[in-house]
Amino acid sequence: QRLPRMQEDSPLGGGSSGEDDPLGEEDLPSEEDSPREEDPPGEEDLPGEEDLPGEEDLPEVKPKSEEEGSLKLEDLPTVEAPGDPQEPQNNAHRDKEGDDQSHWRYGGDPPWPRVSPACAGRFQSPVDIRPQLAAFCPALRPLELLGFQLPPLPELRLRNNGHSVQLTLPPGLEMALGPGREYRALQLHLHWGAAGRPGSEHTVEGHRFPAEIHVVHLSTAFARVDEALGRPGGLAVLAAFLEEGPEENSAYEQLLSRLEEIAEEGSETQVPGLDISALLPSDFSRYFQYEGSLTTPPCAQGVIWTVFNQTVMLSAKQLHTLSDTLWGPGDSRLQLNFRATQPLNGRVIEASFPAGVDSSPRAAEPVQLNSCLAAGD
């Protein structure tokens, strides 16, 4: 059952110009961890769950083998007794990078390029999306999601990592951007603003939305996140804007109702499994896509960004709960956790639908300025 969504037909955003980034520097969280699959009998997971850098921390993932499923590491190392039938043993090790990406923050020192040189790259995220300049690409088919419907048990880890609130996803959530472009979901997290100040990362014609959800995926071509970092298409993020609507969003309420439990930085709780796809817009066929980066250190490039045209609606109270409950480092509220938009530097944003065509009566023959790069696909 779908929750109320909006903006089903018209391209996202209005013509109004959102406020400029309140952040001096480009700052953002890192795509975080995700768990491993179940061990087969006799092999309970022995995960090395460490922090991996990136858009809210990225976990390590072990590929499916005959007897295990895909594995994904989490933040903190834990070692347990042997023996779980559906939890393949996790022996993969995450190689820590030389730079310490754990010490960064939004809007201040140290400058992100000092934390990770990739943050000064030419093809960074987020970006401002201008539908009129997007290249309509008919080859971009509707996204396919499989296994995103989770029963209440086992429960999922919801964590305040000081940069965002992050939900670690179990193995088996499969996503396809198209034929041969297959991914596994690792985690999801949110970006938001503050009272009266929007906090989405991406913008549409300069308009910033109240908040934004990111679902981070690892390509099935890679066994581990650190192998995929910086590789074209190694990681993919599904992004959707959150807007204010008249009704409570029941899917989001399952997470938002637990935020008080993790108000303190570094705290976590367990939440019942839920329909992860219900956190996304219902229209998987209309979206923008471009190649960018993680929006937090290490800012690795080669990330395929898919930004839904349709938005997700939350009540005003829910948006307030999101932006006004969590605390970050140094006794400061966890707010405005978004990075400034980055220059396209010649990149072309593709659209799966003719976004440049304004359907309003005053539109005369609109011109699509950019052509689809994947036209031959």
Epitope: D84, P85, Q86, P151, P170
Partner: antibody, heavy 119, light 110 residues
């Protein structure tokens, strides 16, 4: 290795009560959700109840809701099923099972304990 | 009447291949919930055979495989052996009924 051992079964009259226990070892008990599944003589498997690792969330089949209570003592690595207002149709072998950390499958099962409800 | 429907029995000769179907509805398998398979040898507790539609726990031979499509799932057993004679159950989650099992399928070797 993972071991689950049920106990507490036996013969009870209709309307009576019984408390089943499941002693767990070989894994970090508090990290895993647990479940009870039963099997009537000569019949198939029927899910009865489940509980989260912390014990904060519990779930029941409609057939036992209001009569059975699942609980756990993580300090004792033990899962419980308190069965009240027992009926003849509750007669079955009761298994405790360990739910996976990332899968809803039941990866390990105990050997079961027989509950007979009869006058 | 089980929420997930399995054939009551299947049979095959040693070395042959058999499949066991598990048919659900839009509130369970069709809604995207994973399917798991269990083997119960006579007089013993069930044992996990396939989890999350297609994955085999360690120790389960490659002769056993699972698949899922739309509102149904299947368990395939190739190279049938005498000790495969058992009851097989599928299990999933149902949005209205919580965890659900199929009625079970008795595999008999000819």
């Amino acid at each position: 290795q993972v071991q689950l051992q049920e106990s507490g079964g036996g013969l009870v009259q209709p309307g009576g009560s019984l408390r089943l226990s499941c002693a767990a070892s070989g894994f970090t008990f508090s990290s895993y959700a647990m479940s009870w599944v039963r099997q009537a003589p000569g019949k198939g498997l029927e899910w009865v109840s489940a509980i989260s690792g912390s014990g904060g969330s519990t779930y029941y089949a409609d057939s036992v809701k209001g009569r059975f209570t699942i609980s756990r003592d993580n300090s004792k690595n033990t899962l419980y099923l308190q069965m009240n207002s027992l009926r003849a149709e509750d007669t079955a072998v009761y298994y405790c099972a360990k739910i996976g950390r990332y899968s809803s499958s039941l990866g390990y099962w105990g050997q079961g304990t027989l509950v007979t409800v009869s006058s | 009447q089980s929420v997930l429907t399995q054939p009551p029995s299947v049979s095959g000769a040693p070395g042959q291949r058999v499949t066991i179907s598990c048919t659900g509805s839009s509130s369970n398998i069709g809604r995207g919930y994973n399917v798991h398979w269990y083997q119960q040898l006579p007089g013993t507790a069930p044992k996990l055979l396939i989890y999350d539609n297609t994955n085999r726990p360690s120790g389960v031979p490659a002769r056993f495989s699972g698949s899922k499509s739309a509102t149904s799932a299947s368990l395939a057993i190739t190279g049938l052996q005498a000790d495969d004679e058992a009851d097989y159950y599928c299990q999933s989650y149902d949005s209205g009924l919580r965890w659900v099992f199929g009625g079970g399928t008795k595999l008999t070797l000819l």
